[in-house]
Every structure is written in C-alpha cells, then in structure tokens.
Amino acid sequence: MMTGTIETTGNISAEKGGSIILQCHLSSTTAQVTQVNWEQQDQLLAICNADLGWHISPSFKDRVAPGPGLGLTLQSLTVNDTGEYFCIYHTYPDGTYTGRIFLEVLESSVAEHGARFQIP
C-alpha cells in the first residue's frame, strides 16, 4: 500500500536569466527510492539513480545542475521554461510517486519564489 506523500515547491516564479531549484520530498513512507526522474511535460530533464548516480539529458546539460539532494537546479532561465515540471519517484515496495511543480519565468525584476523552498 502506498502511504507516502510528495511535498513539492508548488507554484513558483523566477526571473528570466536567473536560476531556480526544483525540489520534491517524499515523506511518510519507509520505501526505498531507486530512481528519481525529472520531466518537463513529456521531456526528460534528468534522472538520479540510487546505484548509478545522476544523468542529465544532453539538451539540458549546459543549464541543468544536479541537486541539491534529489532536486534539480535550472539555470539561465528563459520564458520558454515556464510550465509544469514533474518529479517521479520510483520506490520499492510502494511503487511510483509523482509530484508536480509549476514554474513561471517572469520578465520583470520582481519574481516571488514559492514559500516551501527558497533560493537564498
């Protein structure tokens, strides 16, 4: 039975040209995480495999950095980065958990970040 829950940064915004941390946290379960996939719509951004480490998709290598933890840092943001992002946690024995984050990249110099996780 799947007892865990995924906490995410929720809806966040950031400035064009800046960077943002996408973060998910799996709680309320003792399930072992085997791999986390980060996807934007249907496009793979990166994976973190518990045994084999991080792998960043080639088209994002220049502006996606692994971490912190199982999170993902997006750099050099453009307005095209606006949209939904998903963290997909593969675990056993529970199965798959999915979290959703909506990122809005703003042209203006004032962009409010989500309250759950923040970039210093």
């Epitope: 085997t34 791999q35 996939n37 249907d42 793979l44 994976i47 045994d51």
Partner: antibody, heavy 116, light 106 residues
C-alpha cells in the same frame, strides 16, 4: 505495464556478427538504464553492459568490451546488442533488462547459436 | 570485480521443509538482490535490496544479511518453488551474479 520484447533466435557462422533487438513499451524508454545479460548453456548470468537511451551513454564489462556494442534509438524505443567475431563461446541466450534498483524487467531472451 | 559464491549448488528439500541458501561476496556490498529462474524462462526479480520481496512473491520467502554474507530462506517449501536462485550485487562495477542455487523438491 513494462514489457521488453526481444528479436528471435539466430544461427550464425563463426567469425560473423549478429545484432539482436529489445523493444520496450509501457514506460519512458529514454529515462532508464537498459542492460544486457548473457547466459551460456547450463550456465549462470553474466552482465555485458548498459546503455542510457536518453543520450547513448554506455558502460561495458571489461571482459566483453571488444565483443559487444550497445546502441539505442529513442524514436523506436528499441535497444540493440551487436556481437562481433563470433565463436562457439558466444553461443548463449542474451537478455535485455531494465535496471531500477535491481533488474526489475527482463526480455524473454534471444538464443544465439554459433555453428559452422 | 566482486565475486559472489552461492551455496549449496544444489539443494534438495521436501514440501513443508524450511530451507536456507547463502551468498558470500568477496568484498563487502551494500545489499543483495535475488532472482528466481525456471528452465526456459527469463529470471524474475525475487528479493530486492536484501530483504524486500518483489511483487507477487509469497511471504514464505525472506532475505537477510549484510557485508559479505547474505541468505534467502523459504519457511515452508512448496512444489512451485523448484527453480534456480541467483544473487546479484551492484555495489561496485561491474554488477555480478552468483552461480546459482538449484532448489529441487524430493
């Protein structure tokens, strides 16, 4: 559900090459390591290598590095194992297997027989 | 590479009997995976990360161990358990398998 469908049996001559396929369905092919495992007749299991279909990154068992070449095509969700300069020692069943904290999904296996 | 030694090579048991098979590693590993294989079929994931039963595996199976010594135990053997069981590690490259323990029923 996750399925790995492998190509059919092959009978090949010594010195020749063979290319076998593994078509994946039921998951996002590009985001998971695909592995190949060899099982000789009446023998145990031996890891050949792995490929990350998202960018073609590969890693091989040093023992079989000159024997095997792994490729993958995202467009068709298919991974390939090519074996070269075949000898009787290469006669075996070859499995593709997805790694997710264990070899969680396996193809049905492809029998390769090397015989003159 | 890490060598995994399984014992016994062949295990003969009667239905209802408790059996244990072991897997020893030539160096310490974080955890061990186990697979069941029947003739003419591909291996099936059986136990993940030392002690987690794969989906559909009966509760009579259990796994334990740490460091260089791991084991798979069947509390009461049934006819359908007749198969070869392989241990496997990927704590260091390359991943390796044991030679297998063949469980036969009397």
């Amino acid at each position: 559900q996750v399925q790995l469908q492998q190509s059919g049996p092959e009978l090949v001559k010594p010195g020749a090459s063979v290319k076998i396929s593994c078509k994946a369905s039921g998951y996002g092919f590009s985001g998971y390591w695909m592995n190949w495992v060899k099982q000789g007749p009446g023998k145990g299991l031996e890891w050949i290598g792995r490929i990350f279909p998202g960018d073609g990154d590969t890693d091989y068992n040093g023992k079989l590095k000159d024997k095997a070449t792994l490729t993958a095509y995202k467009s068709s969700s298919t991974a390939y194992l090519q074996l070269s300069s075949l000898t009787s020692e290469d006669s075996a069943v070859y499995f593709c297997a997805r790694w997710l904290g264990g070899f969680t999904s396996w193809g049905q296996g492809t029998l390769v027989t090397v015989s003159a | 590479q890490i060598v995994l030694s399984q014992s016994p090579a062949i295990l003969s048991a009667s239905p209802g009997e408790k059996v244990t098979m072991t897997c020893r590693a030539s160096a310490s590993v974080s955890y061990m995976h186990w697979y069941q294989q029947k003739p003419g079929s591909s291996p099936k994931p059986w136990i993940y990360a030392t002690s987690n039963l794969a989906s559909g595996v009966p509760a009579r199976f259990s796994g334990s161990g740490s460091g260089t010594s791991y084991s798979l135990t069947i509390s009461r053997v049934e006819a359908e358990d007749a198969a070869t069981y392989y241990c496997q590690q990927w704590s260091s490259d390359p991943p390796t398998f044991g030679a297998g323990t063949k469980l036969e029923l009397k």
